[in-house]
Interface confidence: low
């Protein structure tokens, strides 16, 4: 009997004949058995009991050098030797032309437009710096214990004061090269910077000369006002700002060429600087005239406040705005500066977030909008600038007029509420391709409701629907509207509802889908080649 | 310094509703939310649901309506009933509050009260 | 609802061994939240806001990640260590919670 032993490939040692001349059948017994199958790298050798049996075997130690050259030379070998390397070249040649073939018809990749740092989220407006802090600390020194809280709310730019001096309506008395010393000094601005820098938020500064007056621009000295706004800009570039905001720039005269005038010494000091310009005007040919003569200028405005709060009308303001503004940056605010509830009842904040957020552009907010603040229910607070209510202990004045939900506090307890769909809100505009920087477009879902889809390339895709209505609807969604890079699918996941109750991450039939009164959805689907 | 304390019979029958007491001192329920969460014998925490400061609540979906949350702000209690209990109801009930503020969190929780829904 | 998925489900570790356990989420959360519990008492709250160490905590516990995945690593395990650790999401109703990493001391 022969006896099967098993022996890893590396054990294997070959002795120091050459590999043609090793003998394959040898007199010491070492033969390979035929039937030796391979095993998990491991070969069988059969270990020959029987010297004589081994011994009687014919010796053979394979054909010689000049033997093999005569073989390989004869027609046959050298015919399919022919046969194989023509097959090789032609496999070959196949796979290339597979490649190519796969290659030029595969869809591009859409090449990414350049992306400023304004292109990927919120700004976030802090006008009064005492009103946001509370409790008298209104300080530069206190604001820099507050970005942490700017840093959840995922905003990307801070568009901070006037905090510059400026004696009412006095010329000479307002000086934009200095800090207001209520508000600090230059080294905590310095400080500010170098925090906020760190946590990646940006400082704009707002240079609105006569900020305490009754015109932000002195009306009678327009032209010594402007060599100050100029001479800050330079100042405030070279101290690291990323921007500047001037508002109320309807009472500026020739507006649009001192815009230009500052765009250009903001941008030639860096492409990475921002200038925003702020008008009360709603009107869209004042803004339009305003944005033609000022590449890269972002402009708040009043012009969404007008929308009546309609589905049809606000679609029709948003998509005439992007009409006439072709494919230049938007910002999207009801304001140049007052917060969403001066414009808005509260059951429509949400639905007002979600279509901020979610608008090809930049969301402009305004302190206090992540969380509701309405001057109207804080006795004697002023409407442009009441206090923020970031516990309740910040409005002491009247005790119990301030309820926890009405608190940065109490908000953030509950993933329930405007603060927490805020925060969601911004995680997702800053991170979504299709809402980064996705091509949008509007359609028909049925009297009362906005409905629109942003997409990009191959990423995943939004559909927003926004009921603004006080009644509950069906959304006939009119994907006819649509080109075909655009289409709808028949499910898309919700993403979120503004509206509690539903189970997000569900799939929703677009046939049939059903919004409660003042409802907007976000809902997700993957791009369909 | 601020506590919680379940109380309820440990012992339901199958069909019957399950009631439950949070007994709280050190913080007032006309503050913040008011959590009741379940963990059943494999370990497995389900949130039941909550009630608010303003007496609203809101119940997971799972539960198919059978839980209901109401308070007595006068006894600074809530309470927890679950309809229709089934032996698969069977776990231990925590009431519990959460704060979560900017760069705070605390989470208070009762020491848990086993529920058994037997025949 | 957003639905946690831990694992592993149960691991041991010997003194000084460094751990690592995970948690992934079916949609993307802004942070995570852990909790610790042995057995016989109630959860404690134990690591927020992804990475903050609650009240208490030693040094050697942190928490990373972002998104839908998000760990919680104990630098060198030690015996009062051994709990079991859930991850949790304040990102919207209803809360939820992984099913839970028993930590053993090997």
């Known amino acids: 009997m022969s006896q099967d032993t098993e022996v890893d490939m590396k054990e294997v040692e070959l002795n120091e004949l050459e590999p043609e001349k090793q003998p394959m059948n040898a007199a010491s017994g070492a033969a390979m058995s035929l039937a030796g199958a391979e095993k998990n790298g491991l070969v069988k050798i059969k270990v020959a009991e029987d010297e004589a049996e081994a011994a009687a075997a014919a010796k053979f130690t394979g054909l010689s050098k000049e033997e093999l050259l005569k073989v390989a030379g004869s027609p046959g070998w050298v015919r399919t030797r022919w046969a194989l390397l023509l097959l090789f070249w032609l496999g070959w040649l196949g796979m290339l032309a597979g490649a190519v073939v796969i290659i030029v018809r595969a869809p591009r990749c859409r090449e990414l437009p350049a992306q400023k740092w304004w292109h990927t989220g919120a700004l976030y407006r802090i006008g009064d710096l005492q009103a946001f802090q509370g409790h008298g600390a209104g300080n530069l020194a206190g604001l820099k214990g507050r970005l942490d809280y700017l840093s959840s709310l995922k905003v990307k730019g801070l568009v901070l004061g006037p905090i510059h001096k400026n004696q009412k309506d006095d010329v000479a008395q307002t000086d934009l090269l200095q800090i207001d010393p209520n508000f600090g000094s230059k080294e905590d601005f310095d400080s500010l910077l170098q925090s906020a820098k760190k946590k990646s938020i940006r400082v704009i500064l707002d240079l609105t000369p006569n900020y305490r007056g009754e015109n932000s621009w002195f009306s009678t000295q327009v032209d010594t006002v402007a060599t100050k706004v100029k001479d800050a800009l330079e100042f405030w570039l070279q101290a690291g700002v990323d921007g500047f905001q001037v508002r109320d720039i309807e009472n500026l005269k020739d507006a649009s060429s001192f815009l230009a005038e500052w765009q250009n010494i903001t941008k030639g000091f860096s492409e990475d600087r921002l200038l925003i310009a702020g008008t009360n005007s709603s009107d869209l040919q004042q803004i339009l005239s305003l944005l033609e003569s000022n590449k890269d200028l972002l402009l708040t405005s009043s012009y969404l406040s007008d929308s009546g709060s309609t589905g049809e009308h606000t679609k029709s303001l948003v998509t005439q705005y992007l009409n006439a503004t072709g494919n230049r940056w938007c910002s999207w605010s009801l304001s140049q500066a007052r917060l969403l509830t001066s414009f808005l009842p509260a059951q429509l904040l949400r639905l007002y977030q979600l279509m901020l957020f979610t608008l090809p552009g930049t969301p402009v907010f305004s302190y206090g909008d992540e969380i509701g603040l309405d001057a109207a229910a804080l006795p004697g607070q002023p409407m442009e600038a009441p206090v923020m209510l970031w516990d309740e202990s910040s409005f002491p004045d009247i005790p119990g007029a301030v309820s926890a939900n009405m608190t940065v506090k109490g908000q953030s307890e509950d993933p329930g509420s405007l603060l927490s769909l805020f925060r969601r809100l911004s995680d997702q505009r800053s991170k979504e391709r299709s809402l980064l920087h996705g091509d949008f477009h509007a359609f028909s879902a049925g009297p009362g409701l906005f409905s629109y889809i942003r997409h990009w390339d191959q990423n995943e895709r939004f559909l927003v629907v926004l009921n603004f209505g006080d009644v509950g609807l069906s959304a006939g969604l009119q994907a006819s509207d649509l080109p075909a890079s655009a289409s709808l699918p028949a499910k898309a996941d919700l993403l979120l509802s503004t509206q509690p109750g539903r189970e997000e991450g569900s799939p929703l039939e677009l046939e049939r889908l059903k919004l409660e009164p003042h409802e907007g959805l976000l809902l997700r689907f993957p791009y369909a080649a | 310094e601020v506590q919680l304390q379940e109380s309820g019979p440990s012992l339901v029958k199958p069909s019957q509703t399950l009631s439950l007491t949070c007994s709280v001192t050190g913080d007032s329920i006309t503050s913040g939310y008011w959590n009741w969460i379940r963990k059943f014998p494999g370990n497995k925490l389900e949130y039941m649901g909550y009630?608010?400061?303003?007496?609203?609540?809101y119940y997971n979906p799972s539960l198919k309506g059978r839980v209901s949350i109401t308070r007595d702000t006068s006894k600074n209690q809530y309470y927890l009933q679950l309809n229709s209990v089934t032996t698969e109801d069977t776990a231990t009930y925590y009431c519990?509050?959460?704060?979560?503020?900017?760069?705070?969190?605390?989470?208070?929780w009762g020491q848990g009260t086993l529920v058994t829904v037997s025949a | 609802q957003i639905v946690l998925t831990q694992s592993p489900a149960i691991m041991s570790a010997s003194p000084g061994e460094k751990v690592t356990i995970s948690c992934s989420a079916s949609?993307?959360?802004?942070?995570m939240y852990w909790l610790q519990q042995k057995p016989g008492s109630s959860p404690k709250p134990w690591i927020y806001?992804?990475?903050i160490l609650a009240s208490g905590v030693p040094a050697r516990f942190s928490g990373s990640g972002s998104g839908t995945s998000y760990s919680l690593t104990i630098s060198s395990m030690e015996a009062e260590d051994a709990a079991t650790y859930y991850c949790q999401q304040y990102q919207s109703y209803p809360l939820t919670f992984g099913a839970g990493t028993k930590l053993e001391l090997k």
């Open positions: 806001r992804t990475s």
């Open positions: 519990q509050r959460h704060v979560i503020y900017d760069y705070t969190w605390f989470a208070y």
């Open positions: 949609s993307s959360v802004g942070y």
């Open positions: 009630i608010s400061y303003s007496g609203s609540t």
